[in-house]
């Protein structure tokens, strides 16, 4: 650090004083010197280092008429809002000719109530779930001892006897407030009060109970919710975008979910108005007066196939000699699954009904054995999926080939060429 030489007497006639105070204090350090000739610029040092950005003012008063007479120079360093970083040894420094002079030191000290570097923050936690809160304070004067309070009740017999910087809370069953007191020789400072809101735990065991083509019944086990009863649970369902949508653990749905509310108990809900034979993802969250739990993971589920909702359309049945030609079109009504084929039934008067599986073809030729004389022959057709047969069409009549003669009908399916 620069030092004044001993060859000449120091120009300083007034040295910086001492300041000791609490954080935020405003104070001024002052030094005065008397010099002959042009007044020098006064610099301030803190702990031996020049302060480049000091908030200082310099006043110069001539003691005579001539420039070469003596001058009184006063420099004032203003400290606004005293902080720990302001503390230390302060000196004034001047360069006079080839010599450097420094004043006697003054000291700035911080001593007051503890100051919080970290305070507990508001947060939400699931009921009966461990969490940590943080609090950190400093002096001077040191030491600073902390005392945690829960709902204004101290958690230790005296400051410094309980947890200090970090408070581990093994779990809460009701919304609570936490604060921390910092104690030192000057007194006590109290932190902000953090509100810890207790939400229900995430539900567990979300699973499928039963399923129909257009509805799914799901159930779950509620998590603990502390002293606050669950008011309802919310279930969300989204279409699974052909495997491109939600994967395990993905947080947000790719589209607007279908949302249903379930009053509780029971912890079960029937989701209706779904598409048959369609994959969905579902998740659930439960709510108390304090707010909602976190969502469960997305659970992949699927509605089963249903039977076709209507019969095949535009059935026509015509006869040519011993052959009957029947054709139809796919049902207009929803199939509710993958069409596997058609069943055809035909019956003549006084003859047993014959049931045939046609497969996915939409026409068939029936070979009427013998002389083909069957009266009042009627045909009906139904579509089917893996879930079973849809409704049968109304019977479509064929004109009698030879009225009055009834012979057994022996069917042969002729493959269309």
């Amino acid at each position: 650090a620069p030092r004044g030489t001993q060859a000449e007497e120091s120009p300083f006639v007034g040295n910086p004083g001492n300041i000791t105070g609490a954080r935020g204090l405003t104070g001024t350090l002052r030094c005065q010197l008397q010099v002959q000739g042009e007044p020098p610029e006064v610099h301030w040092l803190r702990d031996g280092q020049i302060l480049e950005l000091a908030d200082s003012t310099q006043t110069q008063v001539p003691l005579g008429e001539d420039e070469q007479d003596d001058w009184i120079v006063v420099s004032q360093l203003r400290i606004t809002s005293l902080q720990l970083s302001d503390t230390g040894q302060y000196q004034c420094l001047v360069f006079l000719g080839h010599q450097t002079f420094v004043s006697q030191p003054g000291y700035v000290g911080l001593e007051g109530l503890p100051y919080f570097l970290e305070e507990p923050e508001d947060r939400t936690v699931a009921a009966n779930t461990p969490f940590n809160l943080s609090c950190q304070a400093q002096g001077p004067p040191e030491p600073v001892d902390l005392l945690w309070l829960q709902d204004a009740v101290p958690l230790a017999t005296a400051p410094g006897h309980g947890p200090q910087r970090s408070l581990h809370v093994p779990g809460l069953n009701k919304t609570s407030s936490f604060s921390c007191e910092a104690h030192n020789a000057k007194g006590v400072t109290t932190s902000r009060t953090a509100t810890i809101t207790v939400l229900p735990q995430q539900p567990r065991n979300l699973h499928l109970v039963s399923r129909q083509p257009t509805e799914l019944e799901v159930a779950w086990t509620p998590g603990l919710s502390g002293i606050y009863p669950l008011t309802h649970c919310t279930l969300q369902a989204v279409l699974s975008d052909d495997g491109m949508g939600i994967q395990a653990g993905e947080p947000d749905p790719p589209e607007e979910p279908l949302t249903s509310q379930a009053s509780v108990p029971p912890h079960q809900l029937r989701l209706g108005s779904l598409h048959p034979h369609t994959p969905y993802h579902i998740r659930v969250a439960c709510t108390s007066s304090q707010g909602p739990s976190s969502w469960t993971h997305w659970l992949p589920v699927e509605t089963p196939e249903g039977v076709p909702l209507g019969p095949p359309e535009n059935i026509s049945a015509t006869r040519n000699g011993s052959q009957a030609f029947v054709h139809w079109q796919e049902p207009r009504a929803p199939l509710q699954g993958t069409l596997l084929g058609y069943r055809l039934a035909y019956q003549g008067q006084d003859t047993p009904e014959v049931l045939m599986d046609i497969g996915l073809r939409q026409e068939v030729t029936l070979e009427l054995q013998g002389d083909g004389s069957v009266s009042n022959l009627t045909v009906c057709v139904a579509a089917y999926t893996a879930a079973g047969d849809g409704p049968w069409s109304l019977p479509v009549p064929l004109e009698a080939w030879r009225p009055g003669q009834a012979q057994p009908v022996h069917q042969l399916v002729k493959e269309p060429s």
């Epitope: 065991n205 699973h207 499928l208 109970v209 039963s210 939600i246 994967q247 395990a248 993971h297 992949p300």
Partner: antibody
Amino acid sequence: QVQLKQSGPGLVKPSQSLSLTCSVTGFSISSGYYWNWIRQFPGNKLEWMGYRSYDGSNNYNPSLKNRISITRDTSKNQFFLKLNSVTTEDTATYYCARGWLLHYTMDYWGQGTSVTVSS
Amino acid sequence: ELVMTQSPFSNAVTLGTSASISCRSSRSLLHSNGFTYLYWYLQKPGQSPQLLIYQMSNLASGVPDRFSSSGSGTDFTLRISRVEAEDVGVYYCGQNLELPLTFGAGTKLELK
């Protein structure tokens, strides 16, 4: 609260049929879930035997397919296991259990019935 | 059918310490939907099996969070962070990806 309670004889002669009953309270067996039978051999090995679904369909372990039948009586909320032509190899503790749909996770189990096959 | 292999056959641990049980499947249990269809059961002495973990890592209701499970498609580990006296019994892994459902041979956890 769902409970499964088992009953049935503890001793069966070889070549005869083993029949056990699982009585369910707290949930209707025709309203949902798969209703399973599992057995545990001496030495602790577990074997899934099959289930009766809430909709009346069945699924059996191929290793037992020709001998096993799982039926139910919805009016009594009971389901049953019948295992034909038993041998000493069928000596085990038999459990009934409720299984979730689609992926069969079994969350409620009966208390178990120890069955010995011996003449 | 899918074969489940567990190790070790038995595991003796001290109260308060951690324990690990391994399970391997003969094929991947990872479904195209992103979930892994492995579960763990605990059978306490004289009791029926009880569900601990489903879909590889989800704790069943009422299961303390000192239990955890992780793994790949074929190799899985059940961990108990601080063993308590009530944790003794036989632990089974099982697969529910497909029928027939199959189980591991079990790992017996006992106290030293």
